[in-house]
Interface confidence: low
């Protein structure tokens, strides 16, 4: 004869209040004959849950049909799980007697548990932009969760960051729990593009962790390169000279040419290009009037990034006697196809002021 | 700031229907759920029932069911209490609570409360 | 249902003192206590949570202890603002049930 196993599989079961529980309990052998019965705890106190027999058990139903002659599944469903449905379930096989039935054999125990999922995780990064090479602080933060074991991790582009502090409130216990991690995140050039990740894993999520994201575009800010270049030929009376920005984000930009370190005010033709790493470059091009008595012109482009300090660069004008003396109709080549080009630019400047103008 | 906010005091007769709110502000209101409490004057405090504002679904305290109807309107963050055929022993204050922490979870303790309707059942 | 009993109804007590209130519950319901102070014509305030968790800005001299079946809150310097009713709650198993209450007077 096949000794009778009691088999509760799960150790421990997780529920949220107001939903319904199945606790599983199969039987190895249908011997001796007897009842299985379902109770809460263990000793004399021990509380009744289900007996098919007798009793009125309203809010529990079997899995199978117990009636069946061959059934060897007594798992059972509670509904409308509350607070004080938690304690240790097991299913106990009795042998039938006369005039009792005596108890002869019980699984291992199911402990039930409440469980709460926690939050979807909200990221928040710093107040302030920061340029490359310095630490920003992300927060992650999850809240209403149970039991207190929970797992985060913090991801930089998928790789996992180590960097980071995290405590889960309140320490002692309590129906549900909070958890705040603090990752700090270097900042790299190239970061516009990059996101921060948390995630969160706890055991009701059952193996699909929750995740919050923040874009390090939010946080970084890459200060631009400026280089000023005169172009080497005149158009008629006019030099072209070219200022150019390079590598910075946000887009928030203010450009102004200064002649001899008077502000000009006239429409300068610019473009605005975006690089694969998300920063920007931003082109302006100004022309200059040149005369035998215009011989010391400073000029001067001043760019203010995104509210920062002004940042400018100058440059003397070279006004060879050869470019005095060149004139707007000479020999059609390069200085024919650089007024073509100007052209384009004056003509196509109006449509990127909006981009000049924007704070 | 989260607030609790509740309908004004209620004088009926015996026999009468009574219908407090409860207005919710400052959270997401079908994130946690609601319990009523009550307090006859110069008493302790009952708790009535819970409430899943998610789900609607309530949990009542076996004194308060069957004149006792509680329900939402989660389009407008607020919960009610309904009190059919009023006695003399339900002149009392009532007060909303709410859970502590996110649904899912069970209720508890209470942190937020409304600052309580008088109502007073007289012939 | 499980009772918390309260069994000191009042307390007399004087400014500066060490006061202890006490409650027991009927059955064992771990730490799942609450406590709770109301003043005349207003709502209970939570003061303390799961026995012994201080709620955020409540004065360090209110205490909670205590599990299973008997749990104490106390005042350790007492003062003239502390003077009102005072609740356990457990939330152990429904239906949730609160302390009739201990109310602090001045000697």
């Known amino acids: 004869e096949e000794e009778l196993q009691m088999i509760q599989p799960e150790k421990l079961l997780l529920v949220t209040v107001g939903k319904t529980a199945t606790l599983h309990c199969t039987v190895t052998s249908l011997l001796p004959v007897g009842p299985v019965l379902w109770f809460r705890g263990v000793g004399p106190g021990r509380e009744l849950i289900y007996n098919q027999k007798e009793g009125h058990f309203p809010r529990v139903t079997t899995v199978s049909d117990l009636t069946k002659r061959n059934n060897m599944d007594f798992s059972i469903r509670i509904s409308s799980i509350t607070p004080a449905d938690v304690g240790t379930y097991y299913c106990v096989k009795f042998r039938k007697g006369s005039p009792e039935n005596v108890e002869f054999k019980s699984g291992p125990g199911t402990e039930m548990a409440l469980g709460a999922k926690p939050s979807a995780p909200v990221v928040l990064g710093p107040a302030a932009r920061t340029t490359p090479e310095h630490t920003v602080s992300f927060t992650c933060e999850s809240h209403g969760f149970s039991p207190r074991d929970i797992t985060l991790k913090w991801f930089k582009n998928g790789n996992e960051l180590s960097d980071f502090q995290t405590n889960v409130d309140p320490t002692g216990q309590s129906v549900a729990y909070s958890i705040r991690s603090t990752a700090r995140v270097v900042l790299d050039p190239w970061d516009v593009r990059s996101q921060v990740i948390c995630e969160v894993a706890h055991v009701t999520l059952q193996g699909d962790p929750l995740r919050g994201t923040a874009n390090l575009s939010e946080a970084i800010r890459v200060p631009p390169t400026l280089e000023v270049t005169q172009q080497p030929m005149r158009v008629g009376n006019q030099v072209n000279v070219t200022c150019q920005v390079r590598k910075f984000y946000p887009q928030s930009l203010q450009l102004t040419w200064s002649e001899n370190g008077n502000v000009c005010q006239r429409e300068t033709a610019s473009t605005l290009t975006e690089n694969k790493d998300g920063t920007y470059n931003w082109t302006s091009w100004f022309l200059v009037n040149i005369s035998d008595q215009r011989d010391d012109v400073v000029l001067t482009c001043q760019v203010k990034h995104d509210g920062q300090l002004a940042v400018s660069k100058r440059l003397a004008l070279e006004v060879t006697v050869h470019q005095k003396d060149q004139s707007s109709d000479a020999t059609p080549g390069p200085a024919s196809s650089l007024t073509a080009l100007l052209l384009i630019a004056v003509l196509l400047g109006p449509i990127y002021v909006p981009w000049k103008q924007k704070t | 700031q989260i607030q609790l906010v509740q309908s004004g005091p209620e004088l009926k007769k015996p026999g009468e229907t009574v219908k407090i709110s409860c207005k919710a502000s400052?959270?997401?209101?079908?994130?946690?759920?609601m319990s009523w409490v009550k307090q006859a004057p110069g008493k302790g405090l009952k708790w009535m029932v819970w409430i899943n504002t998610y789900s609607g679904v309530p949990t009542y305290a076996d004194d308060f069911k069957g004149r006792f109807a509680f329900s939402l309107e989660t389009s407008a963050s607020t919960s009610y209490l309904q009190i059919n055929n009023l006695k003399n022993e339900d002149t009392a204050t009532y007060f909303c609570a709410r859970d502590p922490h996110y649904y899912g979870s069970s209720p508890a303790w209470f942190v937020y409360w409304g600052q309580g309707t008088l109502v007073t059942v007289s012939a | 249902d499980i009772v918390m009993t309260q069994s000191q109804k009042f307390m007399s007590t004087t400014i500066g003192d060490r006061v202890s209130i006490t409650c027991e519950a009927s059955?064992?319901?771990?730490?799942?206590v609450a406590w709770y102070q109301q003043k005349p014509g207003q709502s209970p305030k939570l003061l303390i949570y799961s026995a012994s968790n201080r709620y955020t800005g409540v004065p360090d001299r209110f205490t909670g202890s205590g599990s299973g079946t008997d749990f104490t809150l106390t005042i350790s310097n007492m003062q003239s603002e502390d003077l009102a009713n005072y609740f356990c709650?457990?939330?152990?198993?429904?239906?949730?049930?609160f302390g009739s209450g201990t109310k602090l007077e001045v000697k």
């Open positions: 059955q064992i319901v771990g730490i799942a």
């Open positions: 400052g959270y997401t209101f079908t994130t946690y759920g």
């Open positions: 709650q457990q939330y152990s198993a429904y239906p949730f049930t």
